[in-house]
């Protein structure tokens, strides 16, 4: 798998999308996990609804949300109030039994808020020692959900 880079601004929301073959992964729940080291395990952050038919319902774990368009074949992860420590390597996964197939490897980069003049020295970027060959960069611009805004699924 190639690695897709998603860049977001500190303090804002970042939306990560993972497209997949909707028939190949029919009936399978999905998950978002964080890679612990280059060869380490992928630690589950959040997974879609326990009932696959309700995968369109957004599920949260802390500041991370997941929702799955099972017909269109797009898994969407929202990282709210992005922080420097959110930067790193993640995976979108398709679950079957106790196993997981990787749908996409994702490198999250956190950019300094241009309106925030505090020291940006602690913001994370991949160092030269870390190689992500053939990485594809996607700039994601998103907004935070307004207070009280309920993320209903599309009706059509």
């Amino acid at each position: 798998h190639n690695t897709t880079v998603f860049q977001g601004v500190a303090g804002q929301s970042l939306q990560v999308s993972c497209p997949y073959d909707s028939m190949k992964h029919w009936g399978r729940r999905k998950a978002w996990c964080r890679q612990l080291g280059e060869k380490g395990p992928c630690q589950r952050v959040v997974s879609t609804h326990n009932l696959w038919l309700l995968s369109f319902l957004r599920r949260w774990n802390g500041s991370t949300a997941i929702t799955d368009d099972t017909l269109g074949g797009t898994l969407t992860i929202t990282l709210r109030n992005l922080q420097p420590h959110d930067a790193g390597l993640y995976q979108c996964q398709s679950l079957h039994g106790s196993e997981a197939d990787t749908l996409r490897k994702v490198l999250v980069e956190v950019l300094a808020d241009p309106l925030d003049h505090r020291d940006a020295g602690d913001l994370w970027f991949p160092g030269e020692s870390e190689s992500f060959e053939d990485a594809h960069v996607e700039h994601s611009i998103s907004r935070s959900l307004l207070e009280g805004e309920i993320p209903f699924p599309p009706t059509s």
């Epitope: 073959d21 029919w26 696959w52 079957h96 039994g97 106790s98 196993e99």
Partner: antibody
């Protein structure tokens, strides 16, 4: 009606090559994984591997990896199991089966089976 | 690989009897288990999936239970057509593995 129709019985000599087939009908062939299962005479069932005809993604059992090749031609809704050099120990009944994912539990089960292809390898 | 062990390997029973076959996994497989019936010279047939869900068209006298490592297939009242060999299979992980089979014979 979902149907998997396998090719006929084969008698081969050790060292010969062979390709058996499994044709699916009555459903969208490219939307389901197809598995192959071996049953040696008087024995149990052994899962060999599986293929997703939509993109030919394939998984093998470690016991069969390198021993057989699983392929598919989606244009004719057919999956294949092949050997490049048969051994006497390959004598068995071979079944293809559709793997259907059950959305209740996100795993898949063999819900439709071919009638089996008997392969006999003898000098 | 996950090992699946069935017991007994064979059982003799009469029409109308209640029969229970057990299957044990070498490690926890949640409820990712199937039961199949196979008659001589025929392909296996799916009876139960997800440990306890009855496949469409299968008579209600068949039922499955269990989770984790221990599972059972129960036939509440044996019919003549039920005499066959039964296999369990784990759908937890690759490689998929089957039990060695339980042959159900007429007493």
């Amino acid at each position: 009606e979902v149907q998997l129709v396998q090719s006929g019985a084969e008698v081969k000599k050790p060292g010969e090559s062979l390709k058996i087939s499994c044709k699916g009908s009555g459903y969208s062939f490219t939307s389901y994984w197809i598995g192959w299962v071996r049953q040696m005479p008087g024995k149990g069932l052994e899962w060999m591997g599986t293929i997703y005809p939509g993109d030919s993604d394939t998984r093998y059992s470690p016991s069969f990896q390198g021993q057989v090749t699983i392929s598919a031609d989606k244009s004719i809704s057919t999956a294949y199991l092949q050997w490049s050099s048969l051994k006497a120990s390959d004598t068995a009944m071979y079944f293809c089966a559709r793997q259907r994912t059950m959305y209740y539990d996100s795993s898949d089960y063999f819900d439709a089976w071919g009638q089996g292809t008997l392969v006999t390898v003898s000098s | 690989d996950i090992q699946m062990t069935q017991s007994p390997s064979s059982v003799s029973a009469s029409v109308g009897d209640r029969v229970t076959i057990t299957c044990r996994a070498s490690q926890g497989i949640s409820s990712w288990l199937a039961w199949y019936q196979q008659k001589p010279g025929k392909a296996p047939k799916l009876l139960i999936y997800a440990a306890s869900s009855l496949q469409r068209g299968v008579p209600s006298r068949f039922s499955g239970s269990g989770s984790g490592t221990d599972f059972t297939l129960t036939i509440s009242s044996l019919q003549p057509e039920d005499f066959a060999t039964y296999f369990c299979q784990q759908a937890d992980s690759y490689p998929r593995t089957f039990g060695q089979g339980t042959k159900l014979e007429i007493k």
